[in-house]
Structure formats: structure tokens, C-alpha cells
């Protein structure tokens, strides 16, 4: 097991997950750790505890390894980091990788007010309701940005989008969470359609909502942007 010493001078590895950092309960996920060609061992940590290790074979590429989680559960959802060893030196820790398990317990209802088809600039609010009491709700836009909207609420949360622009067009789903890494089943999708004339640039928000406060849960998992949310709903899109 890796020992903390002052010798940790090697650059930090990059960590990412495929097909997604959101994994349905019981499904598998691959965690990749990319270090150096000279690496003799990689170690994966989960919530600060030693999880797994891999000693790459010289016949294979040694600069990255794959850790396979065969069945994702609430017990394996959380924050992962990895390290690698080269010679006597250990690397610094990778950036944290946040793995979320979905498909737990219940399914929320999602609807949009005033209606799913609105005109440009109209105020729109999404509502997410889960009969099972939960502490936080998440709203995701499929193939959207790499941010998730979240709001605290007991049984219901509302997500005011402000005056909508064409950037708001798309399909949304919501989740209730039992903690930050254990989420409900996804709601049925709701598609927001925007009608109207030429878009007024003054209506365009700085981020895809009119308030940055709602966009807190950042999904990017490394500085190279290797993890995006384009495969949230299709676990076969990446190999």
C-alpha cells in the first residue's frame, strides 16, 4: 500500500470513467487511470480507502490501466482517486472522480411550467417531484453542458430557467438523491421546445441558465476534459 512520503514528486495521473460517471445500479463501469509509461503499479482509492491495484504488463501499454467495477452499488458510489508508482517514487493523487449510482428506490415525476412548448424569452420552470423524501434533486439536460442543476427540497424542487433562449432547447430528466452519489431512477424525459422569431442576444444567459447559482455539480473529472456527459443515457456509446 502506498505510503505518504515527501518523495511524491511524480506528476499526478488522469482519472476518468467509461461509459459514464453515472452508472445504473448493478451495471458495470471502467475507471481508467493514466500515468506514465514507466509505471510499475497503479493504485485506486475509494473515499480514501485502498480499493484495487493493477501492475501493468510490459507487453501492454503501461501508461494507463483499467479498473473494472463489475456491479455498481451505493457502496461503490463516491469519490475515486488514483496513484502510480515508478521506481521508488509515487505520484501525486489524481483529481477526484465522482461516480454516481442511479436507479435506486423510486422514480420522480418531471414537468415543465407553463408547458413544454414555449416562445423565445418566456419564463420557464421545471418541477421535479419524488414521493420518497429526499434531500436534493438534480436536473440534467441530455447531451448538454457538463454541469448539472441541483436544488434542495423534501418532496419537490423547482428549477426556474428564467427567460428561455434557444440554448434551453432539449430533453431533460431529473433525479432525486439519497446522498450526492446515490440517485433515484431517472424521470421520464421532458422535451422543451422553443418557438418564436429571431433570437434577441440580450436574452442569452451567460451560462445555459439565467442564474449561475443553480449550476453547482461539476461533472468534469480531469483537466483534459476526458469525461463528458454525452453518454449519460446511452451506456453503449463509448467502448
Amino acid at each position: 500500500q502506498r505510503i505518504n512520503t515527501e518523495k511524491e514528486t511524480l506528476p499526478k495521473p488522469i482519472i476518468w470513467a467509461k461509459p459514464s460517471i453515472m452508472v445504473t445500479n448493478g451495471n458495470s463501469v471502467n475507471i481508467w487511470c493514466q500515468g506514465a509509461q514507466s509505471a510499475s503499479e497503479y493504485q485506486l482509492y475509494f473515499e480514501g480507502s485502498f480499493f484495487a491495484l493493477e501492475r501493468p504488463k510490459p507487453s501492454r501499454s503501461m501508461n494507463k490501466v483499467r479498473f473494472f467495477i463489475s456491479q455498481m452499488t451505493s457502496h461503490t458510489a463516491g469519490i475515486y482517486t488514483c496513484f502510480y508508482q515508478s521506481g521508488e517514487l509515487w505520484s501525486k493523487s489524481s483529481n477526484p472522480l465522482k461516480l454516481v449510482v442511479t436507479g435506486l428506490y423510486d422514480t420522480p415525476n418531471l414537468w415543465v411550467y407553463p408547458r413544454p412548448e414555449v416562445t423565445l424569452g418566456e419564463n420557464v420552470t421545471f418541477f421535479c417531484q419524488l414521493k420518497t423524501a429526499t434531500s436534493k434533486f438534480f436536473l440534467l439536460k441530455e447531451r448538454g453542458s457538463n454541469h448539472i442543476q441541483n436544488k434542495y427540497g423534501n418532496i419537490q424542487a423547482e428549477f426556474p430557467m428564467g427567460p428561455v433562449t434557444r440554448a434551453h432547447r432539449g430533453t431533460y430528466r431529473c433525479f432525486g438523491s439519497y446522498n450526492d452519489y446515490a440517485w433515484s431512477f431517472p424521470s421520464e424525459p421532458v422535451t422543451l421546445l422553443i418557438t418564436g422569431g429571431v433570437e434577441n442576444s440580450s436574452l442569452a444567459p451567460t451560462d445555459p441558465t439565467s442564474s449561475l447559482d443553480y449550476w453547482e455539480f461539476d461533472l468534469s473529472t480531469n483537466e483534459s476534459g476526458l469525461q463528458k456527459d454525452s453518454a449519460f443515457w446511452d451506456h453503449t456509446t463509448q467502448n
Epitope: F51, E54, R55, R66, F67, F68, T76
Partner: nanobody, 126 residues
Framework: EVQLVESGGGEVQPGGSLRLSCAAS????????MGWFRQAPGKEREFVAA???????YYADSVKGRFTISRDNAKNTVYLQMSSLRAEDTAVYYC????????????????????WGQGTLVTVKP
């Protein structure tokens, strides 16, 4: 569905040896990573040793040099050879499997394992 059945436990004197066996049902054994854990009375379950599908091994510091994990894919069995046994090795020993797995992954964290045996008791006393 994988079923794991441990055997070989018993009572032994300090300094003695035992070999635990874990027989796995099904055809998936060759694609499984295997591990041994133990739980002493009143304590949490702890990692002992693990072996990847490609025979890479890893041991807890407390058993390194005394215990050896091995596997026989033809017999669908994983072994834990225990020598120089101490009183603090007294525990129920559990065999666990990760099915399927990949390459040389060695799993140390108990929640990574998705199949568990019922356990076999090892008692070390004079």
C-alpha cells in the same frame, strides 16, 4: 450465479499451518478475481489476500510472508496457505469473488466483491 464454499478451517496451535480452500461453482471462475477476508469476534471484516485472474497477488501487511494465495482454474478453486499462525489470526475466513473482472485487477476493498462464501472458522490457541 456463482456459489463459493470454503473449507479447511479448524483449530491449530500457534506456529502451525492450515490450508483453506474455496470451491467456486459455474464456468466463470477463470474470469474472476478472488480474495480472502477475515472477521474476528467483535471486529470489522478485514482484507487478507487477493489474486487476479492472471495470478498477480497482494497481501495485507499483517500476513505478508506467512500466507500464500493461489488458484487452480482447472479445479475452480482458490487456496489460502497459512503458516506461522498466531492467536491474532483467529477469525472466520471468507472467500470472495469479483465476476467478471479484467486483466490483472486485484481488489482490496470488500464492496468491490459481488460474491461471498459463508466462511470457515480458524482458531489459533495453545
Amino acid at each position: 450465479e456463482v456459489q463459493l464454499v470454503e473449507s479447511g478451517g479448524g483449530e491449530v496451535q500457534p506456529g502451525g499451518s492450515l490450508r483453506l480452500s474455496c470451491a467456486a461453482s459455474g464456468r466463470t471462475f477463470a474470469s474472476a478475481a478472488m480474495g480472502w477476508f477475515r472477521q474476528a469476534p467483535g471486529k470489522e471484516r478485514e482484507f487478507v489476500a487477493a489474486i487476479s485472474r492472471s495470478d498477480d497477488t497482494y497481501y495485507a501487511d499483517s500476513v505478508k510472508g506467512r500466507f500464500t494465495i493461489s488458484r487452480d482454474n482447472a479445479k475452480n478453486t482458490v487456496y489460502l496457505q497459512m503458516s506461522s499462525l498466531r492467536a491474532e489470526d483467529t477469525a472466520v475466513y471468507y472467500c470472495a469473488a469479483v465476476v467478471p473482472t479484467y486483466g490483472s485487477n486485484i481488489y482490496v476493498y470488500s464492496a468491490a466483491y459481488n460474491y461471498w462464501g459463508q466462511g470457515t472458522l480458524v482458531t489459533v490457541k495453545p
